[in-house]
């Protein structure tokens, strides 16, 4: 079965030191428990988080993300997942790509994280 992968359309913002959540889902929604799901960072495809065979594959992570990420899978039965990144850093700013792979079929969606300096951040409004 074919599907599309949908991520946030607008950049997600986070402060250095905070945690941030990057949502990603497939449409039409379907159970993705048996799929491979992951996030990587272009252009060098550094692995941010990888979920395969029903387990998080920590050994494949880039060192700078080890211990800082968590895949929220509460709604994976509906094809919805969220990547949580803790202790956000300036170097986390930029593009992330989320993908779902079902056997040989893979689709992905790009998203952007904007990281702001908390020492100069002014609350909107």
């Amino acid at each position: 079965g074919q599907f599309r992968v949908i991520g946030p359309r607008h950049p997600i913002r986070a402060l250095v030191g905070d945690e941030v959540e990057l949502p990603c889902r497939i449409s039409p929604g379907k159970n993705a428990t048996g799929m491979e799901v992951g996030w990587y960072r272009p252009p060098f495809s550094r692995v941010v988080h990888l979920y395969r065979n029903g387990k998080d594959q920590d050994g494949d992570q880039a060192p700078e993300y080890r211990g800082r990420t968590e895949l929220l899978k509460d709604a994976i039965g509906e094809g919805k997942v969220t990547l949580r990144i803790r202790n956000v850093r300036f170097s986390d700013e930029g593009g992330f790509t989320c993908f779902f792979r079902d056997h040989s079929y893979q689709e992905e969606a790009a998203m952007e994280l904007k990281v702001e300096d908390p020492f100069y951040w002014v609350s909107p409004g």
């Epitope: 030191g17 060192p63 700078e64 850093r89 170097s91 908390p118 020492f119 100069y120």
Partner: antibody, heavy 116, light 107 residues
């Protein structure tokens, strides 16, 4: 010319308290984050704490969290560090520095000695 | 926390020598790396920020390079006033951390 002048250091017994001050001049103090960095005798540099321009956001090293409090008074162009429950390992020269992550100007430092 | 490791911890050099100090981060920090110089009894002084940008007023014999995990501070021709201790610092996130320092001594 940017100037940062620390004061308030001295000898204190373990468990005691001290309040450090840093008087700033030569730049628009309220427009910059400020920090404290310390250096134990003969050792390297250790970041202690930083504070945002308005004072609403603060960050601390794990080694001082819950014991030290950073604050600022923009009307007086002054940065503070309230140090409570002092330990022998807090003995160091304490530097006031301009910036939150990159420190482009530093004061001359004030020595804090914690000893019985 | 991100660990910063400098090498060597000390070196002896002569005036006019080319000196290279390296700094390695325990994980990628992009280009969020600063270099400071400290002379005995004095406060540190910012030399280079963002891995390779020379701070205003710093002589051009100082240069920085690198990104990711490996960084270098180079003094192209050592001058008498350059004998000091040099520290790298990652400014990528909380907490910011420093290398242990490299002492440059007169040979």
């Amino acid at each position: 010319e940017v100037q940062l002048l620390e004061s308030g250091g001295g000898l204190v017994q373990p468990g005691g308290s001290l309040r450090l001050s840093c008087a700033a001049s030569g730049f628009t103090f309220s427009s910059y984050a400020m920090s404290w960095v310390r250096q134990a005798p003969g050792k390297g540099l250790e970041w202690v704490s930083s504070i945002s321009t308005s004072g609403s956001y603060t960050a601390y090293a794990d080694s001082v969290k819950g014991r030290f409090t950073i604050s600022r008074d923009n009307s007086k162009n002054t940065l503070y560090l309230q140090m409570n429950s002092l330990r022998a390992e807090d003995t160091a020269v304490y530097y006031c520095a301009k910036g939150g992550y990159t420190f482009d100007y530093w004061g001359q430092g004030t020595l804090v000695t914690v000893s019985s | 926390d991100i660990q910063m490791t400098q090498s060597p911890s000390s070196l002896s050099a002569s005036v006019g020598d080319r000196v290279t100090i390296t700094c390695r981060a325990s994980q990628s920090i992009s280009s969020y790396l600063n270099w400071y110089q400290q002379k005995p009894g004095k406060a540190p002084k910012l030399l280079i920020y963002s891995a390779s940008t020379l701070q205003s007023g710093v002589p051009s014999r100082f240069s920085g390079s690198g990104s990711g995990t490996d960084f270098t501070l180079t003094i192209s021709s050592l001058q008498p006033e350059d004998f000091a201790t040099y520290y790298c610092q990652q400014s990528d996130g909380n907490p910011t951390t420093f290398g242990q320092g490299t002492k440059v001594e007169i040979k």
